[in-house]
Structures are given as structure tokens and as C-alpha cells.
Amino acid sequence: AGVFELQIHSFGPGPGPGAPRSPCSARLPCRLFFRVCLKPGLSEEAAESPCALGAALSARGPVYTEQPGAPAPDLPLPDGLLQVPFRDAWPGTFSFIIETWREELGDQIGGPAWSLLARVAGRRRLAAGGPWARDIQRAGAWELRFSYRARCEPPAVGTACTRLCRPRSAPSRCGPGLRPCAPLEDECEAPLVCRAGCSPEHGFCEQPGECRCLEGWTGPLCTVPVSTSSCLSPRGPSSATTGCLVPGPGPCDGNPCANGGSCSETPRSFECTCPRGFYGLRCEVSGVTCADGPCFNGGLCVGGADPDSAYICHCPPGFQGSNCEKRVDRCSLQPCRNGGLCLDLGHALRCRCRAGFAGPRCEHDLDDCAGRACANGGTCVEGGGAHRCSCALGFGGRDCRERADPCAARPCAHGGRCYAHFSGLVCACAPGYMGARCEFPVHPDGASALPAAPPGLRPGDPQRYL
């Protein structure tokens, strides 16, 4: 477990011509706030996909009113960091989206109006526990300067927050092979030996002998990159031979939560709700006392003076869970279905739906082909919200309304000439080549190196490509 922290340094006009107009005016004062969305891995994901690593909203910045005639300066920013707690391992590689929102402070009763000013996105590598990383991103005429870091929450340490620290058993030194836990030099790394051969870059373990894979990797030792292109379903188990995620049981099948924990599915994995006295990804950490500091986010620990008596975390407002690990906001009730992204607009919640879903709560699974006709004998193919027409020969385009030029892609190899034909295309091959696309060289003795030409066609003759 740990926290990703984002510090916004400035938001204002970028260098160069075309300075943007100020987003606020004397008639319509406004203030800024920011939203950050984190996703594991380096995948190019749509803005709509869930913030699987977490998301956070900043406080509102000071009210700003444009000075007439003045160019837009750097705008006043909210105080404080944006913090995104993460419960599992820090993935090392992550994608981010940072949105700058404007809150217009008119006198409307229904709450202030919100609008998105700028959105920047990027993919980065970052080790937990490292120094602040600085970044500058541009969105149109705006420039955003910020720093970020990931830090582990005790007792977790390491670049992925997967190693655990424990108080020293001996006053002078740590056990054999165990290092002090910087910066907590009075604590030692807990012994944790992963499965032999487990990839140090792409695998980690939270219990001795296991090898759990970071996003994008699979196989028993996390050495096989995942390819989802030929897969039917986006969830495991992984196939070590193909690296393909094949359809299988859900993440909660067999209940991975130990010690009476209850399992609930999340968009990427699962989450265990642990009984008192246990915590960790799978409720596997036990014997916890208040001395271990099990309450996150400023929770007050009561009881649990020894490992046999349970502790209770009294959470501050805004947090809940047996360890105060769950941030509570109005999106915590998950109103958006089918992986939709919940946005709290202040006066209400809104769902940004993933492709293929619609409705206020993303409750409608779009029947891609309903009411859609593919022209000229094409057939409609369902496809994740974006219907696709499989067109008859000679036609193309989204709805098969365009006459396709079958020769546009230069399908005839080795200098063959292409002729459009009512049923497709015909290649007239250059001397020495044959085949539907002139792909086979002809041997000097007239025999082809690959399948012979059909009866009645000489090697140099045009052939129809069906």
C-alpha cells in the first residue's frame, strides 16, 4: 500500500504566440481545481477507461477575476497535494491523466457550472520511494507544471511497496540477509523470498514462494508479455505459452482473501475486506497491534495492546474500512456501471461511459447493429460499441456506401498490374511470377516453386483474386 502524490506548481499560458483568453472574467469569476486519474502499465488507454490505480480531486483554488485588458497570468492554484492512495503493489509504470477544471461562480442556485479547461496525459516509469519527479505538459495554449512521487505506507517499503518492515528483534542488527528499512533504520526488512526465478522486473511477491505479475506480464515467473489481441475475455487466468489472457474464473473465485476476509471484484482485480486484526492485499497480515500502525489516513487506533486482542481504527471523516483505507466521497457509491467513470460535478454526479455503453449510469449496453444498415449487401458486425460493416466485394467505408478501389492497396506483387473487376481484382503478373497476387516466382523450366497454376491458366496470364 502507498500513496501517489501530485503537486501542481503552475497552470497558465504556454510559451509562444496565441496566448489563451483568461478563463474568468469580472462578470463571471471562477476558480480552478484539478483531477488526476492513474492507471497501471504503459498502455495507451482511452480517457474513459477506469482509473484502476485510483483518482483524486483537488480542493478549489482561490477565486480569480480577470483584470480587464491584462493577458491571462498563471492562475491561482488550490493548496495542498493531490493524493491517490493505492492498496496493491505500485506497478512501476503508470499512465496519468491530469484535468484542469474551471468552476464558474455565477449566482446560479443549482450550484456552480463546471467545465474542463485542459487535459494532459502521459506514461511514465516511477519507483516508489524515489524523489519528486518534475514535469511540464502542454494542452493547447495552456501549460501545466507539476511534480509527482509515489511513497509507501508503513509497513510497506521498496520500489513496488511490496516488502514489509518489522521492528528489529535484536537491538544492534538485522537478521541474516535482511537490510535495515531506510529511512526507518530501527526496523528491518521482513524476510520475503519469492518463487525461484520470479522476474525481478515484472514479478513480485507478498508471501514467500509466490510470484505475482505486474500489469502486462504473465506466466508462472512473470516473464511472458501479455497479448490480448487474440483473446476472448480480458480476465485471467494467464496462459504461459501464448501470453494470452483467456476466459476463466473471476478474480474472487475460490476466495483469495484469507482469515475470513470477503472478496469483491474490482475492474482490474479484486479487493479484500478484512476482519479486524488482519490486513494486507489478501488479509494475510495478522497479529497486528496498534504499535504496527494499522490505521491509515490519520485513523486513531484503539485497543490491540497485544497480538491476541483486536484493534479498532476510528476513522476520520472521509475515510472508512477496517483500516481507514477507503476514501469516501460521493463517487464511492459507484453509481456508474460497466466501468463508467464517475465525476462529481459539485451539484450532481455524472458518468462518463466506456465505448459500447450509454445512459446516465452507463446502464445501457449498446446493441451496435440495432437500427444500423450496411449498404450494398454488407453485414453488420458487433464490436464494443462501434458498429462495423463487413462490406461486399467492391464496396468500402463505414456503411459500405463507397465504391472501393480494390487496386488502391497495390495488392499485386513483383510489378504485377492490377485491374479492378466486378468481383474484386485481377493481377496481371510480370514475366517470371504467378499467383493470385503474383507472389510466386516461376522456375526457369516452367514449374512453379509453390502450387501450380490452375489448369487452363498459363503462368503469365491474369488470375482472378476472389
Epitope: 443549482g110 472521509g318 469516501v328 451539484h347 450532481a348
Partner: antibody, heavy 120, light 107 residues
Amino acid sequence: EVQLVQSGSELKKPGASVKVSCKASGYTFTDYYMNWVKQAPGQGLEWMGIINPYSGVTIYNHKFKGRFVLSVDKSSNTAYLQISSLKAEDTAVYYCARQDSLLDYAMDYWGQGTTVTVSS
Amino acid sequence: DILMTQSPSSMSVSLGDTVSITCHASQGISGNMGWLQQKPGKSFKGLIYHGANLEDGVPSRFSGSGSGADYSLTISSLESEDFADYYCVQYAQFPYTFGGGTKLEIK
């Protein structure tokens, strides 16, 4: 017509448990959250918690953690409030109230209330 | 938690009068507030949402206004059925909180 019909009054001894039901009709049950509110004699209103009937996700008022459990049965369009280890101070009228799940509206429809009396 | 301070706690008024009840939140709640009516021995009925919008079926003599942290409920031309308890509620932030209530009595 939207209706929230709650179960009848309960008289319980300290230490016992009670389960109050709230049956919804006249709307799509999973499109609205269900709030639970306590009104103790001579006291104000206290919000106890809220549940999303679609997913079962709950949020509790920190003053009502531990002995109070919210649940739903989607098949019967019914929300439940269970209180265990009852105490005298749990004596109150308990109300369910629906709220649009995108928070476009406040608590527009309420149940008629269930009186729970805890007495030895 | 957001504290909702409602005033007055009670008022005696006559039929046909116009009355206003106010609610002050301990922080801005961006219009996320509603007004409720409870008749003696009965349950609650939603009157106003988002500070100023009338729930379905609520007579137009009820109106809400306000922004930020200060809101008010106004009832014009009071009718006999309007004598009841009124509560404000904020739903900007968990936990939701209620005002202490205002008892409207016939003079």
C-alpha cells in the same frame, strides 16, 4: 406511484437484534440509493448510512459503525437495516428514503417509519 | 461533519401569512441541499432539492433560495395543511446532516 413500505413496529430486549425492511415499488429500484435516517424521541434527525442497491456498496455515518448493517435484496426490491446488540438509546423511529443515484435530487420519497423500542 | 444550523426552531403564524425558514451550513455546499416536511405523527415528504427546485406535486407557494452556505425556504399564503415540522438536509458530503427543525404552529 412511488412507494416505500416499511415493516411494523418492534419491541426488543437489550442485546437482541432487529431487522427493519423497506419494500420499494413504482420505480426502478437499482437507479436510486436508499438512505436510512434515525429519529429518536425528542431528538433531531440523524443520517445513518446509504446503500447502492445495484452494487450493494454502502457508506455509513461514523456514528453508526459496527452494530448497523445495510443490505438489499434486488429480487424483491427490498432494503434492510439490521441493528445488533440493541441498546436503550437505539429506541427510535427509523426511516428509509430513496435518493437518485446521480444525486440530481434530494431524498424525495420516504417510508412511513418503523418504531423500534428497546426495553427490558 | 457539516453542521446545519436552522432557525427559528419554532414560529406561530396565521393562515395567509408568508414565512421564511433559514439554514446555515458550516461550509459551502454548492446547492446540495433539500427541504423536508413532516406532518404530526407522519413521515417525511421532500419539498425542495438543489436549494431551489420544487419536487413533483409540491404547491408553488413553496420556494427555496440561497447559495454557498446560506439557504431559505419560503411559504407564501400559508394554508392549514402547511402547519408541520420542516427540516433542511445537506447532501454535499458524507455524512449527510440535517438541521434541527422548525415547528410551524397556528397562532
